[in-house]
């Protein structure tokens, strides 16, 4: 089948070749930083990825075997010779952006380990995809009226019902532990993050562990890049100054044909610090054109609440590789310097592996002082990764995308 991903163990055939598009809580990851048990599903089969022992209550695991002892293979095995996460990423195919459910929920993609979840604070949080259900029972999800998990807490906090959507790398880097609401029903909180598609199909390794992706990287896919979300140490004063910066022109995504219309409602109103993120499944499937639809994102510095209402960004089926191009968008908050170096929001026509399990989104948030602002994805490479240094909106979108993958256990 698909050629084994380089990094993976004999991932025989196509194992690594699948584009993760449309993943939904199929088993994706969502890292809740503080959340105990944030599963770093994103950590792909890191050698260190010791499966959480079943006995430990695993978030979302309705039934965890008490007996499974990580085998040397599982724990120490370089998970399929997956080199460093970055390596894997490179090997992985662009996975499509989840359309709605998180990979974890769907049971596809990396399998987050509860342990990872526990390691939730791991700065480099890999995308831990948690099933919407939190990888657990289906019915435990806390959902909005529409049944979709909604996240209204600052990213740092994983709302209870939030199942980490596929690889919702919601690794609030040390944001003041927002009320960590454990993923409801043990399922990894879905943060709606969908950026890294590490589909839950493969349990991710513990977040703190070496994060070599356990997923075989699809040989055919472009390498995924580790999205390092670096949040510069924020001091209250600096945060303020940033908030005051002039609105950063958002890339014009008008041409995004697909269902992405959802960015239209994003309003970034930095200010108070409340981040209200309402995630609806991001259906990015058909963002064929080169993203041009951030056109309606309103960045209203000042205000206070960041209310991001993402409706399904339909990246679903094929935001294939054009994503590579958020790479240069750098939002440099600070006296108004906003550099948008290249807005090519080109969502690669099938940002396949990049989002879910391709780009491992590493959130490095240096000393965050009381800052609950959304973490920024950085370096989500062209393989579908979104390289957003400080663009909360983009980060949010990415998050949503990843989150949706987790559901399906992919």
């Amino acid at each position: 089948m698909a050629e084994p991903r380089q990094e993976f163990e004999v991932m025989e055939d196509h194992a690594g070749t699948y584009g993760l598009g449309d993943r939904k809580d199929q088993g994706g990851y969502t890292m809740h930083q503080d959340q105990e048990g944030d599963t770093d599903a994103g950590l792909k089969e890191s050698p260190l990825q010791t499966p959480t022992e079943d006995g430990s209550e695993e978030p979302g695991s309705e039934t965890s075997d008490a007996k499974s002892t990580p085998t040397a293979e599982d724990v120490t095995a370089p998970l399929v010779d997956e080199g460093a996460p970055g390596k894997q990423a490179a090997a992985q195919p662009h996975t499509e952006i989840p359309e709605g459910t998180t990979a974890e929920e769907a049971g596809i993609g990396d399998t987050p380990s509860l342990e990872d979840e526990a390691a939730g604070h791991v700065t480099q949080a890999r995308m831990v995809s948690k099933s919407k259900d939190g990888t657990g029972s289906d019915d435990k999800k806390a959902k909005g009226a529409d049944g979709k998990t909604k996240i209204a807490t600052p990213r740092g906090a994983a709302p209870p019902g939030q199942k980490g959507q596929a690889n919702a790398t919601r690794i609030p880097a040390k944001t003041p532990p927002a009320p960590k609401t454990p993923p409801s029903s043990g399922e990894p909180p879905k943060s709606g993050d969908r950026s890294g598609y590490s589909s839950p199909g493969s349990p991710g390794t513990p977040g703190s562990r070496s994060r070599t992706p356990s997923l075989p990287t699809p040989p055919t896919r472009e390498p995924k890049k580790v999205a390092v979300v670096r949040t510069p140490p924020k001091s209250p004063s600096s945060a303020k100054s940033r908030l005051q910066t002039a609105p950063v022109p958002m890339p014009d995504l008008k041409n995004v044909k697909s269902k992405i219309g959802s960015t239209e409602n994003l309003k970034h109103q930095p200010g108070g610090g409340k981040v209200q993120i309402v995630y609806k499944p991001v259906d990015l499937s058909k963002v064929t054109s080169k993203c041009g639809s951030l056109g309606n994102i309103h960045h209203k510095p000042g205000g206070g609440q960041v209310e991001v209402k993402s409706e399904k960004l339909d990246f679903k089926d094929r935001v294939q590789s054009k994503i590579g191009s958020l790479d240069n968008i750098t939002h440099v908050p600070g006296g108004g310097n906003k550099k948008i170096e290249t807005h090519k929001l080109t969502f690669r026509e099938n940002a396949k592996a990049k989002t879910d399990h391709g780009a491992e989104i590493v959130y490095k948030s240096p000393v965050v002082s009381g800052d609950t602002s959304p973490r920024h994805l950085s370096n989500v490479s062209s393989t579908g990764s979104i390289d957003m240094v400080d663009s909360p909106q983009l980060a949010t979108l990415a998050d949503e995308v990843s989150a949706s993958l987790a559901k399906q256990g992919l």
Partner: antibody
């Protein structure tokens, strides 16, 4: 090479339970979700649920909630599916299938275990 | 079945056959589709994943696509060995689980 090997056929009486195993080899067991899908004679495929092989977390189809239990033993890279309170309509071939990591689908399947009630 | 497929389809060698798979906004409309081929007496085999991706080893005669809430599978240059049952599957947001089509038996 990736291989999912399931346990042998089972014949059970109504009300009993059956536990099917799926021994995995050729890849890092904990790196993938394991799904269980069944197929009644002459019928189509029906998804039962999945287990995160790494954490043990599970997700079951509503239809099977309360009757199915999926577990795994990472030390022997084996996933298990136990179905209780068996009824005649549970007679089917039960498959374990690995959730794709980089795509949307089930990339590898076990050969199936026929359970006759 | 949540996803609807025609029970059967047939064609002669060399022909092109298309199998439809229709669903709704909560499944195909918002999630990627995968296709499986199940030869008599064997386990299903992944044929198409993520709407239109072919695992290595699958002939390019098989192609998948997705438009709205429908995801057809096309088999061009039909061959005798293609005689099999084909199933489409995707995640359903409402049911919160994977759903399959009822299967289509292709006869060559």
């Amino acid at each position: 090479q990736v291989n999912l090997r399931e346990s042998g056929a089972e014949v059970k009486k109504p009300g009993a339970s059956v536990k099917v195993s799926c021994k995995v080899s050729g890849y890092t067991f904990t790196g993938y979700y394991m799904h269980w899908v069944r197929q009644a004679p002459g019928q189509g495929l029906e998804w039962m649920g999945w287990i995160n092989s790494n954490s043990g977390a599970t997700k079951y189809a509503q239809k099977f909630q309360g009757r199915v239990t999926m577990t795994r033993d990472t030390s022997i890279t084996t996933a298990y599916m136990e179905l209780s309170s068996l009824r005649s309509d549970d007679t089917a071939v039960y498959y374990c299938a690995r959730g794709a990591r980089d795509g949307y689908g089930f990339d590898y399947w076990g050969q199936g275990t026929l359970v006759t009630v | 079945y949540v996803l609807t497929q025609p029970p059967s389809a047939s064609g002669t060698p060399g022909q092109r056959v298309t199998i439809s798979c229709s669903g709704g906004s909560s499944n195909i409309g918002s999630n990627a589709v995968s296709w499986y081929q199940q030869l008599p007496g064997t386990a299903p085999k992944l044929l198409i994943f993520t709407n239109d991706q072919r695992p290595s080893g699958v002939p390019d005669r098989f192609s998948g696509s997705k438009s709205g809430t429908s995801a057809p599978l096309a088999i061009s240059g039909l061959q005798s060995e293609d005689e099999s049952d084909y199933y489409c599957a995707t995640w359903d947001d409402s049911l919160n689980g994977w759903v399959f089509g009822g299967g289509t038996k292709v006869t060559v």
